[in-house]
Amino acid sequence: ATKLTEEKYELKEGQTLDVKCDYTLEKFASSQKAWQIIRDGEMPKTLACTERPSKNSHPVQVGRIILEDYHDHGLLRVRMVNLQVEDSGLYQCVIYQPPKEPHMLFDRIRLVVTKGFSGTPGSNENSTQNVYKIPPTTTKALCPLYTSPRTVTQAPPKSTADVSTPDSEINLTNVTDIIRVPVFN
């Protein structure tokens, strides 16, 4: 099995984790994709997933997690906004490909969230606080109940993450077609 690598990210409470998970464009463009947390001694748990089939550049929000699948670019963007200390943990992007096991995208993300001042949410007319004011919509995307394996035989492309600038402007208040999905334990 391929050695699983991780990248560590130390962020402050209130900041945003912004992850790029890239994949083989032709093969996985419309496949359903998911963001998972891996807790010690447990199988990966799916926190959020895209629709099936995955829609291009179509935001899907589950609580503080926002997924966007850029089909044109072979890239899944994952954001976790307003980070909390309890969000600390190991995360990964996967591609669902039933009936086969999910396809894991390297690297895993080791997120460490610490308490502390992370700057003002933003001085622009639309600050990062607005990201939570999203109109309720019909639930469309359902995450498969099965979880992904702990190992994988081939190494797919890497994923990376970063924190948004504190004074960034994120305005999702006028987005009426964001999909909110339930979380499966």
Epitope: E7, D22, H73, R77, K158, D162, V163, I170, N171
Partner: antibody
């Protein structure tokens, strides 16, 4: 042909304002993030701001926050940079660039010169 | 923000030389690095993306390598058209982007 053409540069006094435009053609403008990058005379490249496809996210370099505003009009295939409270250090060639998340800045305009001087 | 350090700032070389430019990131950027070429009075041109992928239309004498924090741009056999300034840029997240300070490749 994929093309970006900037306009709106010129000479402006410190504290003044200027609005740069970038006309896009040859590709689906509404499918791409877009960026502004500047280059002061004899200096290196500095990323200034970028904007998501639908305009819902905008990011700025620290030195222009609160003074510059990036915007777009997808119906007109146009990108804009409103620059207020201009300073001498904002003097530069301003480039509009297509922002492809896998590739980086893969298409650039020819640039427009902004000179801030009294 | 992620800082990008490029070296050398100036490089004197002759046609046919093998040229290597390095770029170091202040933190891991995986493979999210691009290299650009810029000639005086012109806009930058994308050469390499994802650290090692050659942009369409770029001559194969250009190559990129590295991941994490250390990256290299190599020109296997310098041609007259290659005398220019080269910049690295990280695009690990959707913002902010940062460029290296540039490397001017001049005629020896």
């Amino acid at each position: 042909e994929v093309q970006l053409v900037e306009s709106g540069g010129g000479l402006v006094q410190p504290g003044g304002s200027l609005r740069l435009s970038c006309a896009a053609s040859g590709f689906t403008f509404s499918s791409y993030w877009m960026s502004w990058v500047r280059q002061a005379p004899g200096k290196g490249l500095e990323w200034v701001a970028n904007i998501k496809q639908d305009g819902s996210e905008k990011y700025y370099v620290d030195s222009v926050k609160g003074r510059f505003t990036i915007s777009r009009d997808n119906a007109k295939n146009s990108l804009y940079l409103q620059m207020n409270s201009l300073r001498a250090e904002d003097t530069a060639v301003y480039y509009c660039a297509r922002d492809a998340p896998q590739l980086g800045l893969d298409v650039w305009g020819q640039g427009t010169m902004v000179t801030v001087s009294s | 923000d992620i800082q990008m350090t490029q070296s050398p700032s100036t490089l004197s070389a002759s046609v046919g030389d093998r040229v290597t430019i390095t770029c170091r990131a202040s933190q891991s950027i995986s493979s999210w690095l691009a290299w650009y070429q810029q000639k005086p009075g012109k806009a930058p041109k994308l050469l390499i993306y994802k650290a090692s992928s050659l942009e369409s239309g770029v001559p194969s004498r250009f190559s990129g390598s590295g991941s994490g924090t250390e990256f290299t741009l190599t020109i296997s056999s310098l041609q007259p058209d290659d005398f220019a300034t080269y910049y690295c840029q990280q695009y690990k997240s959707f913002s902010p982007f940062t460029f290296g300070g540039g490397t001017k490749v001049e005629i020896k």
